[in-house]
């Protein structure tokens, strides 16, 4: 109970007659009734609804106020809807008035109405019709009013009826103080309320056992003049390894943990982890399972993946394409990537050494997210072993043997590398003479060179080719004053090399008989 009520009067608690003063005697009437739980109670009722100008007063006995300064009056009453009473619409009312009178002693049985101070006019939130009568769900209205600060030793309460049909079921008079409570895992002691209606007393709370103050947010509450704790500021939270149970912090049980005071409650240890004591702030991984440094404590412990499956290869001279299926077991993680280890082997000794850095991997050698790779620039007629390893976030933490899929292959003859150093030797109106250098890596005997050329405007929609065995050639039958694009590639028994970069050459205009060397209009490094 957050608000401690110190009772000064409780009509419901009285079994004998209340014997309050009724004036006139024909007005308010004390009767025995039953409350909503069929418990016998003493009530006062009045239903003088037929005559106008009613003025029926009911006064309590003298009430000593004790230490109170502000007094609360709680009224429980039922009020009958005037519409449910036949023929009384002009005279029936649906409110009554509440008064008080302060004195230092009991002044006797006379009600001196002019001395009483009006507290309020009381209206029902819910009145009831004849159809509701007697059903004990009698639409009991509860109204609370306050008086004070009081200066005398006691007071009377009075109820003025002006022509309503009312039963006063309960009158409770009390004052309040803030009762010791535990709020937000902080203990706040009994606190006397402030004397002023608007005053708030700030109280600092103390964290319960195994709790700590939230960072820079120490628990405080305010005790209002109404005896209510208001405006909780800050809080305590259960330490790591403890969770809130009601107003206490209890240790996490075995197989449970709480890693931070910021977490609300203990969680079951994630898969493949355990805690064998109470109050654990983290769970240890089982043998063979690990947590990556970036893994939060709430994720399962995981292990390295198994080897990739169904590794297949395809050799094209000195290029090998590898493809595989994901591992059967990803170790419980979604961050599986692949890395390729290339070894060049000599079958005679059976020894293998890592491939050099001049090998190309497409798209890359490590951190592969897709399950394929192309290995390029291998030596022709050489033996290679490729190991494909699946890797995840805990692979580097494991001390157990690497798991990989391997394949051994022998490369074929390679096609030649790209022709370089293409030059314009002569440019005429209808012919261009070009020269070039042999590829750096012929990878065999070059049988011929193939020159591809086309008008630049045609954008390779139609092109012509010219074959030659030497490293120079004259291309004839060209149009004057036209820009041509030239590309050259070498040919061996193993196949075609890549085309050289594009070379743009403009033939001479027809009107000019003068011969000169044309300059390149543009050149492009990307091979076609």
């Amino acid at each position: 109970q957050a608000a401690k009520e110190v009772l000064l009067l409780d009509s419901k608690a009285q079994q004998t007659e209340l014997e309050w003063i009724s004036s006139p005697p024909s007005g308010w009437e004390e009767i025995s009734g039953l409350d909503e739980n069929y418990t016998p109670i003493r009530t006062y009722q009045v239903c003088q609804v037929m005559e106008p100008n009613q003025n029926n007063w009911l006064r309590t006995n003298w009430i000593s106020k004790g230490n109170a300064q502000r007094i609360f009056v709680e009224l429980k009453f039922t009020l009958r809807d005037c519409n449910s009473l036949p023929g009384v619409l002009g005279t029936c009312k649906e409110t009554f008035n509440l008064y008080y009178y302060e004195t230092d002693y009991d002044t006797g049985r006379n009600i001196r109405e002019n001395l009483y101070v009006k507290i309020d006019t009381i209206a029902a939130d819910e009145s009831f019709t004849q159809g509701d009568l007697g059903e004990r769900k009698m639409k009991l209205n509860t109204e609370v009013r306050e008086i004070g600060p009081l200066s005398k030793k006691g007071f009377y309460l009075a109820f003025q009826d002006v022509g309503a049909c009312i039963a006063l079921v309960s009158v409770k008079v009390y004052y309040k103080k803030c009762w010791s409570i535990v709020e937000n895992l902080a203990v706040f002691p009994d606190t006397v309320t402030g004397s002023e209606f608007s005053s708030l007393v700030e109280v600092r709370g103390t964290c319960v056992s195994s709790a700590e103050e939230e960072a820079e947010n120490s628990p405080r509450m305010h005790c209002s003049a109404e005896g209510e704790w208001l405006v909780p500021i800050g809080k305590c939270i259960c330490k790591a390894g403890y969770q809130q149970k009601g107003d206490t912090c209890e240790p996490c049980g075995r197989r449970f943990y709480k890693s931070s005071s910021q977490d609300l409650q203990c969680s079951r240890c994630p898969t493949h982890s355990f805690s064998d004591r109470e109050g654990s702030s983290r769970c240890e991984c089982e043998d063979g399972y690990y947590r990556a440094p970036s893994d939060p404590p709430y994720v399962a412990c995981t292990r390295p993946p198994s080897a990739p499956q169904n590794l297949i290869f395809n050799i094209n001279q000195t290029t090998v394409s590898l493809e595989w299926s994901p591992p059967a077991d990803n170790g419980g993680r979604n961050d599986v990537t692949y890395r390729i280890l290339c070894k060049r082997c000599s079958w005679e000794q059976g020894e293998c050494v890592p491939c050099g850095s001049n090998i190309g991997y497409m798209p890359q050698q490590t951190g592969l997210e897709d399950n394929y790779v192309t290995v390029m620039d291998l030596l022709a007629h050489a033996n290679y072993t490729f190991e494909v390893e699946a890797v995840n976030g805990v692979s580097d933490l494991s001390r157990s043997q690497r798991l990989f899929a391997a394949v051994s292959i022998t490369t074929g003859q390679a096609a030649p590398s790209q022709v370089s150093g293409v030059m314009k030797e002569r440019v005429l109106q209808r012919s261009v003479q070009l020269s070039w250098q042999e590829p750096e890596h012929p990878n065999g005997v070059i049988t011929e060179y193939e020159i591809k050329y086309y008008e630049k405007d045609q954008r390779e929609r139609t092109y012509s080719t010219l074959k030659t065995k030497s490293t120079s050639a004259s291309i004839n039958n060209l149009k004057p004053g036209t820009v041509y694009v030239f590309q050259i590639r070498a040919v061996t028994a193993a196949g075609y090399g890549n085309y050289s970069p594009r070379l743009d050459v403009a033939t001479l205009e027809e009107a000019s008989g003068k011969m000169f060397e044309a300059t390149a209009v543009s050149s492009e490094q990307n091979p076609v």
Partner: antibody, heavy 121, light 106 residues
Framework: QVQLLQSGAEVKKPGASVKVPCKAS????????MSWVRQAPGQGLEWMGW????????TYAQGFTGRFVFSLDTSVSTAYLQISSLKAEDTAVYYC??????????????WGQGTLVTVSS | EIVLTQSPATLSVSPGERATLSCRAS??????LAWYQQKPGQAPRLLIY???TWATGIPDRFSASGSGTDFTLTISRVEPEDFAVYYC????????FGQGTKVEIK
Amino acid sequence: QVQLLQSGAEVKKPGASVKVPCKASGYTFTSRAMSWVRQAPGQGLEWMGWINTNTGNPTYAQGFTGRFVFSLDTSVSTAYLQISSLKAEDTAVYYCARVRFTVYGDGMDVWGQGTLVTVSS
Amino acid sequence: EIVLTQSPATLSVSPGERATLSCRASQSVSSNLAWYQQKPGQAPRLLIYGASTWATGIPDRFSASGSGTDFTLTISRVEPEDFAVYYCQQYGPSWTFGQGTKVEIK
């Protein structure tokens, strides 16, 4: 002491009229409605209707309209039941009864001693 | 109009025994029901109103309950002065009485 006083027995011929008085004492007459109830010899109770003693407004039950009239004289705190064109079947004890409205329900809490009206030729 | 049917018509009990009287309405009257006692040669007396609330001065051996269409008046231990006719009465827009139950000495 709250009481309702009715007149003594009346013997009337068919077709005649009778006016039964009901004098209230011990409370404010205009603060409570007045009901009329009929009881034929050896029979049960029949509610005839009621009158608002403050406004004089009457309400008649089914079967008691036309020949039956409720009236008041508040100066002498008396309610009246007048029956005209009397018939033999009007022979009965006629009770006036004070109506009590309360929060918890209504009822007729104070009764007159009854007036026996006999209709006979 | 609402018809009230009381049962039994006559109830024979010995003093000190329990008596249970029933009143059934032809349609719901909520809790708008009163009970009256009438002794021979006397005017009726209000016992209960609001289906279950005692009128002033009524002994607590009388109790009543019910709402809607079914109501009961109970005399826990019948005293000699309780032998009489008992009527239920509903008060809606129009008021009606039941035909009565006679409680007689067995």
